[in-house]
């Protein structure tokens, strides 16, 4: 602790805001929970800090961070999933703030794959489906879905839909004709987990078919 | 002020069933592992089973592992123990126990099970 | 599962100090945190050490826990005894899905 005051790092860390934000991802990597961790300033000098979670463990008490440039990081099988851990922050052996926290309750999802559209000439709509990994998990299965969707002209112009399962059907009179159309989701934990919303996946553009004159109906691509 | 309040105790003949309740206030419930722990008459503290916040994570001693189920209601701030196949050396005095700060930080007043014929 | 052995009496006078050990069977003391529960006669457990060595508040600070890894044992050491502090003390330690508590030691001030 001496050796970090002498040079009067230990001072100046303690006026500075150490407030961080944490996401775990449960089985991530076959049976590997991982944790990220990080600051919520930016500005933060990160040189000599480090992070330490301690409780709700298998078979050890504490374990340290892997520092991955501005992010915290740990993959590990021993998060016990029960109960609060204590996640520090760390010079020395000093802590500089704490926070108690229960990894099931900041879920974040791994982001939705393969999204795609297909358009069914004869239904007039469009089945919307995408996967999740999440199907194969233990733990974490049920999850809500955020599928978002625009015109590509319409920069902030989005409809979102909520839906639990992986399909979706859009309704091509809802959609304007002849028109490029964006569409991607995204997933939160929906049962038994709390947390966050996952990355969005790639976003998938299709195109609307143009209306058929003597039919009203639109044609397909 | 936390206060856990154990109820549904009382004597069963052997390879009947119980189930006690545990009413819980004075915190945020749905917040808390929680957690039943047994005290035979004149002897130590076993611990039974846990139940996590969401309901999900649960786990038991192998004492009772497949004749007792733990659940809870957190609409209604409530602990539940599931009894079957009740023996005669289940016959304890069961606390129901909240997990905070540390692993036990409440407990309540205990509720007793007496197993005989 | 390991076992958690604890002695099942101790004895000290008024002022004196006592040390209740806590062996673990298998497996490291280090894996996971202990903690230490006193039992009065005829009431609940209450916790007077969590994670090895903290203090809840409001337990005065004659009681303190340490771990001995070359012994692989936890102790409760009660310092300046009191008539108040007679009663049953438990050591408890989970692995990575039970919990699991010494058999408990009783504790009589003369």
């Known amino acids: 602790e001496s050796g970090y005051a002498q040079n009067g790092d230990l001072e100046d860390a303690e006026l500075d805001d150490y407030s961080f934000s944490c996401y775990s991802q449960l089985e991530v990597n076959g049976s590997q929970h991982s944790l990220t961790c990080a600051f919520e300033d930016p500005d933060v000098n990160i040189t000599n800090l480090e992070f330490e979670i301690c409780g709700a463990l298998v078979e050890v008490k504490c374990l340290n961070f892997r520092k991955l440039q501005e992010i915290y990081f740990i993959e590990t099988k021993k998060f016990l999933l029960i109960g609060k851990s204590n996640i520090c922050v760390k010079v020395g052996e000093k802590s500089l703030t704490c926070k108690k926290i229960d990894l099931t309750t900041i879920v974040k999802p791994e982001a939705p794959f393969d999204l795609s559209v297909v358009y069914r000439e004869g239904a007039n709509d469009f089945v919307v489906t995408f996967n999740t990994s999440h199907l194969q998990k233990k733990y974490v299965k049920v999850l809500m879905h955020d599928v978002a969707y625009r015109q590509e002209k319409d920069e902030n112009k989005w409809t979102h839909v909520n839906l639990s399962s992986t399909k979706l059907t859009l309704l091509q009179r809802k959609l304007q004709p002849a028109a490029m159309y964006e569409i991607k989701v995204r997933s939160i934990p929906d049962h038994y987990f709390k947390g966050f919303w996952s990355e969005w996946s790639p976003s998938y553009y299709f195109r609307t078919p143009e209306i058929n004159n003597s039919s009203g109906e639109m044609d397909p691509i | 002020q936390v206060n856990l309040r154990e109820s549904g105790g009382g004597l069963v003949k052997p390879g009947g069933s119980l189930r006690l309740s545990c009413a819980a206030s004075g915190f945020t419930f749905d917040d808390s592992v929680m957690h039943w722990v047994r005290q035979a008459p004149g002897k130590g503290l076993e611990w039974l089973s846990l139940v996590g916040w969401d309901g999900f994570f649960t786990y038991y001693a192998d004492s009772v592992k497949g004749r007792f189920t733990i659940s809870r209601d957190n609409t209604k701030n409530l602990l539940y123990l599931q009894m079957n196949s009740l023996r005669a050396e289940d016959t304890a005095v069961y606390y129901c126990a909240r997990q905070g700060d540390y692993v036990f930080n409440n407990w309540g007043q205990g509720t007793l099970v007496t197993v005989s014929s | 599962n390991f076992m958690l052995t604890q002695p099942h009496s101790v004895s000290g006078s008024p002022g004196k100090t006592v040390t209740i050990s806590c062996t673990r069977s298998?497996?490291?003391?280090?894996?996971?945190?202990v903690q230490w529960y006193q039992q009065r006669p005829g009431n609940s457990p209450t916790t007077v050490i969590y994670?090895?060595?903290?203090?809840p508040s409001g337990v005065p600070d004659r009681f303190s826990g340490s771990i001995d890894s070359s012994s692989n044992s936890a102790s409760l050491t009660i310092s300046g005894l009191v008539t108040e502090d007679e009663a049953d003390y438990y050591c408890?330690?989970?692995?990575?899905?039970?919990?699991?508590f010494g058999g408990g030691t009783k504790l009589t001030v003369l």
């Open positions: 994670e090895d060595d903290q203090r």
């Open positions: 408890m330690q989970y692995d990575s899905s039970h919990l699991v």
């Open positions: 298998s497996g490291s003391i280090d894996s996971s945190y």
